[in-house]
């Protein structure tokens, strides 16, 4: 038997993916477990194998269909169970009635690109990936810029309180290498959280013109 505190957390990417992490203190690393999903109003059910991601946590993804297909709605409830093999039987280790649109975590923004760069400013755009049309414009973004000699954790957060897939960074230093990241969050959902950060976009400001004050 497995004892200790257990945590079972799942997020819906708003389209066709439910990602789950189960952590259990004192669980054996070679325990054979799966997540089982049973929607209340769909004619399918699904499972995925939980694979270790650290000493005491396991993760898996339920792929509900094509990446951009809308597989669940705001009225769906999916019963999610962690089942672990004990001899010839399965033991339910954790269970939750999962409301997809209360537990959202979108995919990281993609296609970051520099639209225009000058000596002191840079205009950057991006796209959101696999986000439900249900949100319409009800999304917010956070962005951060990595300056030379600093860490990402030290970078101040810039908040965009609307669906704005671009930003104009100001007061930059000429001829300097920067990196930029952005993440997205729907306004909907009690347990909704930020997406992962996007892949960093590296850019360099233009050098100051010779003979001019900067």
């Amino acid at each position: 038997a497995v004892n200790g505190t257990s945590q079972f957390t799942c997020f819906y990417n708003s389209r066709a993916n439910i990602s789950c992490v189960w952590s259990q203190d004192g669980a054996l690393q070679d325990t054979s477990c799966q997540v089982h999903a049973w929607p209340d109003r769909r004619r399918w059910n699904q499972t995925c194998e939980l694979l270790p991601v650290s000493q005491a946590s396991w993760a898996c993804n339920l792929i509900l269909g094509a990446p951009d297909s809308q597989k669940l709605t705001t009225v769906d409830i999916v019963t999610l169970r962690v089942l672990c093999r004990e001899g010839v039987r399965w033991r339910v280790m954790a269970i939750q009635d999962f409301k997809p649109f209360e537990n959202l975590r979108l995919m990281a923004p993609i296609s970051l690109q520099v639209v225009h760069v000058e000596t002191h400013r840079c205009n950057i755009s991006w796209e959101i990936s696999q986000a439900s049309h249900y949100f319409e414009r009800h999304l917010e973004f956070e962005a951060r810029t990595l300056s030379p000699g600093h860490t990402w954790e030290e970078a101040p957060l810039l908040t965009l309180k609307q669906k704005q897939e671009w930003i104009c960074l100001e007061t930059l230093t000429p001829d300097t290498q920067y990196e930029f990241q952005v993440r997205v969050k729907p306004l909907q959902g009690e347990f909704t959280t930020w997406s992962p950060w996007s892949q960093p976009l590296a850019f360099r400001t233009k050098p100051a013109a010779l003979g001019k004050d900067t």
């Epitope: 399918w44 699904q46 995925c48």
Partner: nanobody, 123 residues
Framework: QVQLVESGGGLVQTGDSLRLSCAAS????????IAWFRQAPGKERDFLAY????????WYADSVKGRFTISRNIAKRTVDLEMNSLEPEDTAVYYC????????????????WGQGTQVTVSS
Amino acid sequence: QVQLVESGGGLVQTGDSLRLSCAASGRSLDTTYIAWFRQAPGKERDFLAYISPRFSHTWYADSVKGRFTISRNIAKRTVDLEMNSLEPEDTAVYYCAAREHSGSTAWEHYDHWGQGTQVTVSS
């Protein structure tokens, strides 16, 4: 891309057993769930069972639970369906199918299919 080829179908009598085999080739099957479905003439494709890639976790339709057994031979890259106590209602074309990362009971979730093997159970 995964290629699937079923074999083992044929004509049997009521009460007989039959073992179907699905040979999988192509890329690594480390994350691939394999399922068996069947389709009788004029009917929808029905889910029978699926098996997971690493731990061989299985899931069965209630209609075949206890009578059909799905198993995986990793070395041979095959997934077998052992069918016992066959009845005329089991007559159908049997298909194996594959999908990545999670198993599903819905046929439309699968993107790779074999060509099927006919099973006929006579009374």
